[in-house]
């Protein structure tokens, strides 16, 4: 297993609809044809997997159908979008990148993106 640098933004604010997007960029030392990207959430010293995708260079990311994540790839950049976020989902979202094929296997883990989610205020009742 060889190390690889992964860069991601420090902070992202989710939209009022609970959608957050950020770029995960990796310094590929070789010409990988298969890449696996995993988003991890760290909160209260616990790490959980949010979603994972495998893709071929030049192809779309393959997330499971029930995933809250979508994404696109361009070169060594992955544009990730996480949907359905609520205030309780605020936390550090870490991008993990694995170059699966061809060998050697490379692994890179970013420093994380702090995603802040603010639940929208309910609309006040209106009198007409």
């Amino acid at each position: 297993c060889k190390a690889m640098h992964v860069a991601q933004p420090a902070v992202v604010l989710a939209s009022s609809r609970g959608i957050a997007s950020f770029v995960c960029e990796y310094a590929s030392p070789g010409k990988a044809t298969e890449v696996r990207v995993t988003v991890l959430r760290q909160a209260d010293s616990q790490v959980t997997e949010v979603c994972a995708a495998t893709y071929m260079m030049g192809n779309e990311l393959t997330f499971l159908d029930d995933s809250i994540c979508t994404g696109t790839s361009s070169g060594n950049q992955v544009n990730l979008t996480i949907q359905g976020l609520r205030a309780m989902d605020t936390g550090l979202y870490i991008c993990k990148v694995e170059l699966m094929y061809p060998p050697p296997y490379y692994l890179g883990i970013g420093n994380g993106t702090q995603i802040y989610v603010i639940d929208p205020e309910p609309c006040p009742d209106s009198d007409f």
Epitope: E34, M56, E60, T62
Partner: nanobody
Framework: EVQLLESGGGLVQPGGSLRLSCAAS????????MAWYRQAPGKEREVVAG????????NYGDSVKGRFTISRDNSKNTLYLQMNSLRAEDTAVYYC??????WGQGTLVTVSS
Amino acid sequence: EVQLLESGGGLVQPGGSLRLSCAASGFTFSSYTMAWYRQAPGKEREVVAGISRSGGTTNYGDSVKGRFTISRDNSKNTLYLQMNSLRAEDTAVYYCRAVSDYWGQGTLVTVSS
């Protein structure tokens, strides 16, 4: 048990065509990006073509663009590779791939007159 069973290889003359098939079983075929790789004698395995789960996105290695077409039928759990205008340098063992987990055993394609 996971199986990727390639078929359709054989001997063909330069300029000819072949259609490879890969029958998948033992896993959820429609959940995987699929690909064809090939390995010529004495060379590294290289990607030929890839296709997304739905079949809506495809990509090709530079050496086969415009000649090869990858497709899939999720209802039949089958991956295909239509190879046209074959050249001697296309001679190789062709492998079916469920990215990034499973490999087939390969089928030999020989292009020779």
